[in-house]
């Protein structure tokens, strides 16, 4: 059974992940056209189901394309370079989902824009945090 300290650690990690994802989304929303227009033509894969920490596997698999898209934007809207930002997210995701169990991610048929993708994972974080508090 999870201890109160491990629950607290999970909550803090999720909050950190949530802030990172929100920072990316805010940065994207500050883009001028045609950068945003171009960005929105990139498609991301969405999880069929995202209700447990193990489902973060689906986010992990999309971090490389996410980094590429952020690199293309060459934005000054982020305090960190995309590589560092995504690296930070990757570390948190790996810790949260754990490496003991191998989970095969199932993706939805429909792809999503970067904005829809980020909003989906922001909602996921908020949902899990609410169950922990």
């Amino acid at each position: 059974a999870p201890t109160s300290s491990s629950t607290k650690k999970t909550q803090l990690q999720l909050e950190h992940l949530l802030l990172d994802l929100q920072m990316i989304l805010n940065g994207i929303n500050n883009y001028k056209n045609p950068k945003l227009t171009r960005m929105l033509t990139f498609k991301f894969y969405m999880p069929k189901k995202a209700t447990e920490l193990k489902h973060l596997q689906c986010l992990e698999e999309e971090l490389k394309p996410l980094e590429e898209v952020l690199n293309l934007a060459q934005s000054k809207n982020f305090h960190l370079r995309p590589r560092d930002l995504i690296s930070n997210i990757n570390v948190i995701v790996l810790e949260l989902k754990g490496s003991e169990t191998t989970f095969m991610c199932e993706y939805a048929d429909e792809t999503a824009t970067i904005v829809e993708f980020l909003n989906r994972w922001i909602t996921f974080c908020q949902s899990i945090i609410s169950t922990l508090t």
């Epitope: 045609p34 950068k35 227009t37 171009r38 960005m39 033509t41 990139f42 498609k43 490389k64 394309p65 590429e68 898209v69 293309l72 792809t111």
Partner: antibody, heavy 121, light 108 residues
Framework: QVQLVESGGGLVKPGRSLRLSCAAS????????MSWVRQAPGKGLEWVAM????????YYTDSVSGRFTISRDNSKTTLFLQMDSLRTEDTAVYYC??????????????WGQGTLVTVSS | DIQMTQSPSSLSASIGDRVTIPCQAS??????LSWYQQKPGKAPKPLIF???DLETGVPSRFSGSGSGTDFALTISSLRPDDFATYYC??????????FGHGTKLEIK
């Protein structure tokens, strides 16, 4: 790093066919629109064809429409250009190029080294 | 299709000169314009996109300006490596992308 390597060029007679390939590496190929751009000897650049990230949309310049077909195999990270009913005016170096977008509204940010297609009897 | 006019077709300049290469679109293309540098026997190299944004790794002596129909590529202080042919390219009239015919920058 991003690499685009073209192959399949050569000498071909008018009316014949040729298939160009472009092996892509160093990026998530299945997220990017790809194009072919050509350059006739001593001439300028001409965009030939473009394909969206998933192959769902293809676009062509008028002079090749109906004769050329652009396609991609995302599992093999390879772009193709099937060229049928070739004409002497199709003689050019053909470049495989990446666009920093999933579809349209995009310039070309990475270019292959090119492959020469010569159409002559 | 939108026509891209690059005039002159060739330009002579000396090392250290400030050079401006113009490009004109036949209709408004907003800032959907890019610039490429090409050397003989080589693939074009991207320099500028969205009219004024510098590609990663391109020296800051290169700059792009303009919007609508009139654009320019400026090299603030010519280096020996800059002698090449420069092409402008519009990606506004999707999907009918068109290039200018190029301006060859030669040593005076």
């Amino acid at each position: 790093q991003v690499q685009l390597v073209e192959s399949g060029g050569g000498l071909v007679k008018p009316g014949r066919s040729l298939r160009l390939s472009c092996a892509a590496s160093g990026f998530t190929f299945n997220r990017y629109a790809m194009s072919w751009v050509r350059q006739a000897p001593g001439k300028g650049l001409e965009w030939v064809a473009m394909i969206s990230f998933d192959g769902g949309n293809q676009y062509y310049t008028d002079s090749v429409s109906g004769r050329f077909t652009i396609s991609r195999d995302n599992s093999k990270t390879t772009l193709f250009l099937q060229m049928d009913s070739l004409r002497t005016e199709d003689t050019a170096v053909y470049y495989c190029v990446r666009s920093p977008a999933g579809d349209w509204v995009a310039y070309f940010d990475y270019w292959g080294q090119g492959t020469l297609v010569t159409v002559s009897s | 299709d939108i026509q891209m006019t690059q005039s002159p077709s060739s330009l002579s300049a000396s090392i250290g000169d400030r050079v401006t290469i113009p490009c004109q679109a036949s209709e408004d293309i907003s800032n959907h314009l890019s610039w490429y540098q090409q050397k003989p026997g080589k693939a074009p190299k991207p320099l500028i996109f969205d009219a004024s944004d510098l590609e990663t790794g391109v020296p800051s002596r290169f700059s792009g300006s303009g919007s609508g129909t009139d654009f320019a590529l400026t090299i603030s202080s010519l280096r020996p490596d800059d002698f090449a042919t420069y092409y402008c390219h519009q990606y506004h009239d999707y999907p009918s992308y068109t290039f200018g015919h190029g301006t060859k920058l030669e040593i005076k």
